[in-house]
Amino acid sequence: PRSIEVKYIGVKSAYVSYDAEKRTIYLNITNTLNITNNNYYSVEVENITAQVQFSKTVIGKARLNNITNIGPLDMKQIDYTVPTVIAEEMSYMYDFCTLLSIKVHNIVLMMQVTVTTAYFGHSEQISQERYQYVDCGRNTTYQLAQSEYLNVLQPQQ
């Protein structure tokens, strides 16, 4: 069998809401993956599991099941959303993210994703990790950078 390639493209959008009383931030982060099937037979994408970390703490997890079938020598782009919560011992971030005197409220998040594919009864797991900037101060749609090695997110104006 030839390789199945998983490429984490980046954050597509981040939608933020706040609970002032609990000093909690809710970030719905939509990410984009490219999955390429280099084989001459179809491959099933069984599931995608993802988690997001902030300051070494897991702030969100998501799992997608029975996602899609990728045909021979084909590629599919898949978006998945991870709901995240920044609260409790990180409640100081509420002060940061809602402080309007700061124009861009970029925080560094670690995106981790594992894709499980299956073909001929055989399962394979491919994982990726990437640090990304996300603005916790406003809803943002990002232009996905194409570079494999550098993913600089620029908020659309």
Epitope: Y18, A20, Y92, F96, T98, L100, S101, K103, R138
Partner: antibody, heavy 117, light 112 residues
């Protein structure tokens, strides 16, 4: 317990200089923006200056711009306000305050600055 | 600059009864993120100001629930449900929507 302790106030002649300090403890200083706020003899509160957690954003009230400089030393948990070309209208009690989206959550006890001949 | 307007004195209030303090801003303090950037502080005699209410309606840590606040984008009211002697002082409203942050002139709570 969060504590902010100001120092450096005193009596100074018009045109003179003073440097105020604010020692922070009881919280992770480098996580928070800080502001200086002053209380005039007429008991009015005026925001003076702002500095973001990492010092990347700095703002001043128009009446102190080009005369006052706010700075911070996150390694020492200290906030500063360098005041130059002082005027009589700068006479006030100066407070440092922890700043953020939830307001000035903590204030120091204040340090009095008197500008007089 | 945003102008914050307060009456200098409240109506004299009897201990144990309720009191209201008003504040008006020259511009709506409701941001597009859904937060209203209006804050209330109390300065007791001889003390530093202390935060009472953040983001228009949220009680700051350690503040008794006798205090509450409500408002629209420009008109705000601080309510004290059962006034106690320790509530005496000057109440300031502040906007943090735009720089420069601006304070109201303060309202002195008067006890009968």
């Amino acid at each position: 317990e969060v504590q902010l302790v100001e120092s450096g106030g005193g009596l100074v002649k018009p045109g003179g200089s003073l440097k105020l300090s604010c020692a922070a403890s009881g919280f992770t200083f480098s996580n928070y923006a800080m502001s200086w706020v002053r209380e005039t003899p007429e008991k009015r509160l005026e925001w003076v200056a702002f500095i973001s957690d990492g010092g990347g954003y700095i703002y001043y009230a128009d009446n102190v711009k080009d005369r006052f400089t706010i700075s911070r030393d996150n390694a020492k948990n200290n906030l500063y306000l360098q005041m130059r070309h002082l005027k009589s209208e700068d006479t006030a009690m100066y407070y440092c305050a922890r700043d953020g989206g939830t307001g000035f959550t903590y204030w120091g006890q204040g340090t009095l600055v008197t500008v007089s001949v | 600059d945003i102008v914050m307007t307060q009456a200098a004195f409240s109506n004299p209030v009897t201990l144990g009864t309720s009191a209201s303090i008003s504040c008006r801003s020259s511009k709506s303090l409701l941001h597009s993120n859904g937060i209203t950037y209006l804050f209330w502080y109390l300065q007791k005699p001889g003390q530093s100001p202390q935060l009472l209410i953040y983001q228009m309606s949220n009680l700051a840590s350690g503040v008794p629930d006798r205090f509450s606040s409500s408002g629209s984008g420009t008109d705000f009211t601080l309510r004290i449900s059962r006034v106690e002697a320790e509530d005496v002082g000057v109440y300031y409203c502040v906007q943090n929507l735009e720089l420069p942050y601006t304070f109201g002139g303060g309202t002195k709570l008067e006890i009968k």
